[in-house]
Amino acid sequence: APTSSSTKKTQLQLEHLLLDLQMILNGINNYKNPKLTRMLTFKFYMPKKATELKHLQCLEEELKPLEEVLNLAQSKNFHLRPRDLISNINVIVLELKGSETTFMCEYADETATIVEFLNRWITFCQSIISTLT
């Protein structure tokens, strides 16, 4: 079972992931981003449910498409190159979701824009941070 120190580490990793996702959202929502309309045409798969750490499997599977869309954005909107940003997120996600490799993601029927996708995972991080004990 997780210890108080491992739970604290999990909280910190979730906060880091939350900040990264918020940074991406702010970057693409930037009024100076001329590629936003184009970026909004890309569709992302949404998790059927996202309440627990194991559901991060669904985020992991969409990181490559996320990187591809971010490559469209002007790099000055982000502190890091999309490849480095997504790599950092991937490391956190892999640690958070654990080694339960047999867990398969199930997706919702409807796809979403990058903004809806990011908002969903931001909500996920916020809710776990507030309820993890």
């Epitope: 079972a1 997780p2 739970t7 999990t10 949404m46 059927k48 449910k49 996202a50 309440t51 627990e52 750490l53 194991k54 654990g98 339960e100 867990f103 199930e106 919702a108 029927d109 909500t123 996920f124 809710s127 776990i128 507030s130 309820t131 993890l132 004990t133």
Partner: antibody, heavy 117, light 107 residues
Framework: EVQLVESGGGLVKPGGSLRLSCAAS????????LAWVRQAPGKGLEWVAA???????YSPDTVRGRFTISRDNAKNSLYLQMNSLRAEDTAVYYC???????????WGQGTLVTVSS | DIQMTQSPSSLSASVGDRVSITCKAS??????VGWYQQKPGKAPKALIY???FRYSGVPSRFSGSGSGTDFTLTISSLQPEDFATYFC?????????FGGGTKLEIK
Amino acid sequence: EVQLVESGGGLVKPGGSLRLSCAASGFTFSSYTLAWVRQAPGKGLEWVAAIDSSSYTYSPDTVRGRFTISRDNAKNSLYLQMNSLRAEDTAVYYCARDSNWDALDYWGQGTLVTVSS
Amino acid sequence: DIQMTQSPSSLSASVGDRVSITCKASQNVGTNVGWYQQKPGKAPKALIYSASFRYSGVPSRFSGSGSGTDFTLTISSLQPEDFATYFCQQYYTYPYTFGGGTKLEIK
């Protein structure tokens, strides 16, 4: 057949403690998130705590620091340790299975906890 | 926390009637909504998941609909055993929250 059977309820004084148990059968216990949901007399349902398959635990502000959820996969059992009990904790406590991708699909019959002096 | 506002809180109807119960979420919850039936002194029983899918063994007269913030449970033709209290629940995010319940009574 999935079965969840709660036990451990009873009368306790304010400030006291109680430990509830839930014995599970009919499914691969270790693979599921389990939850406790309570219902005060004549009232609605309130989610109290959950524990996932990795034993990470989740609970709302109302019980955090007082209630602790735990599980023993070897015994197919779920527990709720309730400390510093208050009159407003009086309720029927249900154990429920949280399906991986959907709602709370199976519920136990409940156990009544009464907090009164 | 996400609030689930259920209406009506009570409803009188007759056997054979068609009835609908609504639930409104305080924010978008996609289709992460379940419906439960509870009879006096008994545990809740899961009826509907993902807003519109019936659990195995649930009669076809029960149907769910909705997405986003507005959800409906409909019983197409009330049977005597359907008189009970019904609850909606969101499982979009922790903490899970429930509607206040709708008590369905015989007219």
